[in-house]
Amino acid sequence: MAVTACQGLGFVVSLIGIAGIIAATCMDQWSTQDLYNNPVTAVFNYQGLWRSCVRESSGFTECRGYFTLLGLPAMLQAVRALMIVGIVLGAIGLLVSIFALKCIRIGSMEDSAKANMTLTSGIMFIVSGLCAIAGVSVFANMLVTNFWMSTANMYTGMGGMVQTVQTRYTFGAALFVGWVAGGLTLIGGVMMCIACRGLAPEETNYKAVSYHASGHSVAYKPGGFKASTGFGSNTKNKKIYDGGARTEDEVQSYPSKHDYV
């Protein structure tokens, strides 16, 4: 039950996180005009990964896309790449985790397979979250550098240099959305990895080997099997981790890497 809850919660947290990463990537407010200690302007500038916008006091907002690839700073391209990789990995992770959910039955999928998929999706969520956090942090670092390096009458924009009165930029809402979303995706991924441990067989499941003693038959088995006597009707060896739902004759189990997580 706890495993199902952990897995389900991990999935939901990751889902929210990835939605947040997508939202942050699409948002225009990655950097916003710094209003502190600046002359009061009747225009408010803000920039995203894909376009820059200007909101006027009139109520009119004008946004212009960055229609060049080569003219954009390498750092901006790197941030874009990190965010897109994060989204793609997160999306694949979500897809995998849906099939890995313990509460969803797909044919005769084994728990070990579900455990495998849960771990895979967990790792994907962790990497996705790290990509988002890294992307947002790189952009934030770029902003801080530009903020302090800016001179009195020159502004180095996303696409070049313009001789004008200094417009300084500070952290926009998208950065905070990105950090939180990346963190949530990371937490969700960790939860999925924890859930994977509970889903996996607890011990190594080798085929039982019986040794017959002179008095009565006792089956000595490694790890995951109870030693059962030869008396009575229960002559089958049953696994203890699933309450004896299936016998070793019904399903053949092999050692899995998840047993050692």
């Epitope: 820059s52 200007v54 006027e56 009139s58 004008e62 004008t164 009165v165």
Partner: antibody
């Protein structure tokens, strides 16, 4: 057609108060910033106040700050200018204007005259 | 505050001639975010409300004849009327619409020579 009609002007004594109104029609009032501009007799134009579309931000020049208050009622499509502690130098024709691209004053009312005199 | 200086204060031009009105700002009115200059030109005739001619320094307002053109960037701007018509004789104001307080120039009165 965009129409702006000012009212509320008149003769007032120094130190007195007056409230100007500007009734707007022909456009979505709640989507535009609005301003008041005045022109003293035989003088140039002077910006008096600006309010953004939702009324959340207001701006004034030092000459009227603390004495004049711009406000709007988007439900009534009306812009207001509350003028307190009036001085002789506030005598002018007051125009209300709709802001447009580039924060330009695209549409103007016909003006209302305010005379501050004892 | 931004100081807007218009020159000349009055200008006498013959009908059909070109008129060039100048406007200078004490600070750059160029916004780096959209590379637009926040300078506006108005025309005002006696007893009438001002009329918008140009915004963003060089964009003509709809309905304004194409004989009116605006140019300049940063701090120096020009309004040019290529061939003066009788209805063009009026007072012209330029305005800073970038910084608060929005400031108007003193105006240029265009008269028939």
């Amino acid at each position: 057609e965009v129409q702006l009609v000012e009212s509320g002007g008149g003769l007032v004594q120094p130190g007195g108060s007056l409230r100007l109104s500007c009734a707007a029609s022909g456009f979505t009032f709640s989507s535009y910033g609005m301003s008041w501009v005045r022109q003293a007799p035989g003088k140039g134009l002077e910006w008096v106040a600006t309010i953004n579309s939702n009324g959340g931000s207001t701006y004034y020049p030092d000459s009227v700050k603390g004495r004049f208050t711009i406000s709007r009622d988007n439900a009534k499509n009306t812009l207001y200018l509350q003028m307190n502690s009036l001085r002789a130098e506030d005598t002018a024709v007051y125009y209300c204007a709709r802001l447009s691209y580039g924060n330009s004053f695209a549409n103007w009312g016909q003006g209302t005259t305010v005379t501050v005199s004892s | 505050d931004i100081v807007i200086t218009q020159s000349p204060s009055s200008l006498s031009v013959t009908l059909g001639e070109r008129a060039t009105l100048s406007c200078r700002s004490s600070q750059s009115l160029l916004n780096s975010g959209n590379h637009r200059n926040y300078l506006t030109w108005y025309q005002q005739k006696p007893g009438q409300a001002p009329r918008l001619l140009m915004y963003w320094a060089s964009t003509r307002e709809s309905g304004v004849p194409d004989r009116f053109s605006g140019s300049g960037s940063g701090t120096d701007f020009t309004l040019t009327i290529s061939s003066l018509q009788p209805e063009d004789f009026a007072t012209y104001y330029c305005q800073n619409t970038y910084y608060y307080p929005f400031t108007f120039g003193g105006g240029t009165k265009l008269e028939i020579k």
